[in-house]
């Protein structure tokens, strides 16, 4: 494949990362899916720059980011070390609450509406954002 | 690689109290609920108790509620159990757990007089 | 409470036998169920989350398929490895519980 130069159509282009952002709602699962139909991955935040970067764009809405821990250690969707990474939970997350009464805990990480994150059950339909990277090898067959 | 090691466990007459301690590390501890199940000797799982990872949340078997206390020092990586009014159906090997994925080794508590 | 029970209580079963370990919940518990494998002496080990989810790490030869009440775990090719005490657990509420075990020895 070729390598992608320049953001799709309808992507916001940052420090050599495109960006989608949604403004329908979905579950996490199905989020993570939409955006690797799209060659991307939900967003990863590896800095405090790019997290008030997605901040703005999202506003004060809950949405996803590629964050869980479904098998036990929190994990980034594309294999960031979530241990040596960047962290901007709320105070007291994550905490796998259970309370909500819709039946297992919470293991699907979003921003909350002051951005800082927070842990929630995966099934909720929240917006969702998907970032590829730049000069990655695109799946697409370059134009002749 | 993650590392749960569990302490505090030995010979206790009924009645008396022990605090198991389980010393982490390897993660970001206060990212995780910890747990403690349990086995009695020759027999199956029992879980017994968990914690969020900030301590705001904590959940007990009704076989121990009333006698035993889960807590959590996240400043030292350990979670305990303070386990009073101990009784001969108390004995076991206690296993921290991890986000019920990732186990100690265990420690053997004997309730016996 | 969730009551967990399994069967068979044990089996025998040679090397290379496919073997099927039943799991039932006493309620609703959608696919908040995990098997671990457990060796005399040993804790216990993670196979399978959420019903279906293969742990990382644990062979192709393990698979799990369930959902609601009913559930099953599955191994392809018996080898002497697998000869251990299976467990199902519910984490769909607190308290969590574990089915009464399962022992596979050899025939």
């Known amino acids: 494949g070729s390598e992608r130069t320049c953001c799709p159509v309808n992507w916001v282009e940052h420090e050599r990362s495109c960006y989608w952002f949604s403004r329908s709602g979905k579950a996490w699962a199905d989020a993570d899916n939409y955006c690797r139909l799209e060659d991307a991955h939900l967003v990863v935040v590896t800095s405090w720059e790019e997290q008030k970067f997605v901040q703005h764009h999202i506003g004060p809405v809950n949405t996803w980011m590629g964050l869980h821990d479904q098998n036990g250690p929190w994990k980034w969707v594309d294999g960031t070390d979530y241990e040596t990474g960047f962290k901007n939970w709320r105070p007291e997350q994550p905490d796998d609450w259970y309370g909500h009464g819709l039946g297992g805990g919470e293991d699907c990480a979003h921003f909350t509406d002051d951005g800082r994150w927070n842990d929630d059950v995966c099934q909720r339909p929240y917006r969702w954002v998907c970032e590829t990277e730049l000069d990655k090898a695109s799946q697409e067959p370059p134009l002749l | 690689e993650v590392q749960l090691l569990e302490s505090g466990g030995g010979l206790v007459q009924p009645g008396g109290s022990l605090r198991l301690s389980c010393a982490a590390s390897?993660?970001?501890?206060?990212?995780?609920?910890m747990s403690w199940v349990r086995q009695a000797p020759g027999k199956g799982l029992e879980w017994v108790s968990a914690?969020?990872?900030?301590?705001?949340?904590?959940y007990y078997a009704d076989s121990v509620k009333g006698r035993f206390t889960i807590s959590r020092d996240n400043s030292k990586n350990t979670v305990y159990l303070q386990m009073n009014s101990l009784r001969a159906e108390d004995t076991a090997v206690y296993y921290c757990?991890?986000?019920?994925?990732?186990w100690g080794q265990g420690t053997l508590v004997t309730v016996s007089s | 409470d969730i009551q967990m029970t399994q069967s068979p209580s044990s089996l025998s079963a040679s090397v290379g036998d496919r073997v099927t370990i039943t799991c039932r919940a006493s309620?609703?518990?959608?696919?908040?169920l995990a098997w671990f494998q457990q060796k005399p002496g040993k804790a216990p080990t993670s196979l399978i989350y959420?019903?279906?989810s293969l742990q990382s790490g644990v062979p192709s030869k393990f698979s799990g398929s369930g959902s609601g009440t009913d559930f099953t775990l599955t191994i392809s090719s018996l080898q002497p490895e697998d000869f251990a005490t299976y467990y199902c657990?519910?984490?769909?509420?607190?308290?969590?519980?574990f089915g009464p075990g399962t022992k596979v020895d050899i025939r």
């Open positions: 757990v991890k986000h019920g994925y990732s």
């Open positions: 657990q519910q984490y769909h509420s607190y308290p969590f519980t």
């Open positions: 959420a019903s279906s």
């Open positions: 390897g993660f970001t501890f206060s990212s995780y609920v």
């Open positions: 309620q609703d518990i959608n696919n908040y």
């Open positions: 914690m969020s990872g900030s301590g705001g949340h904590t």
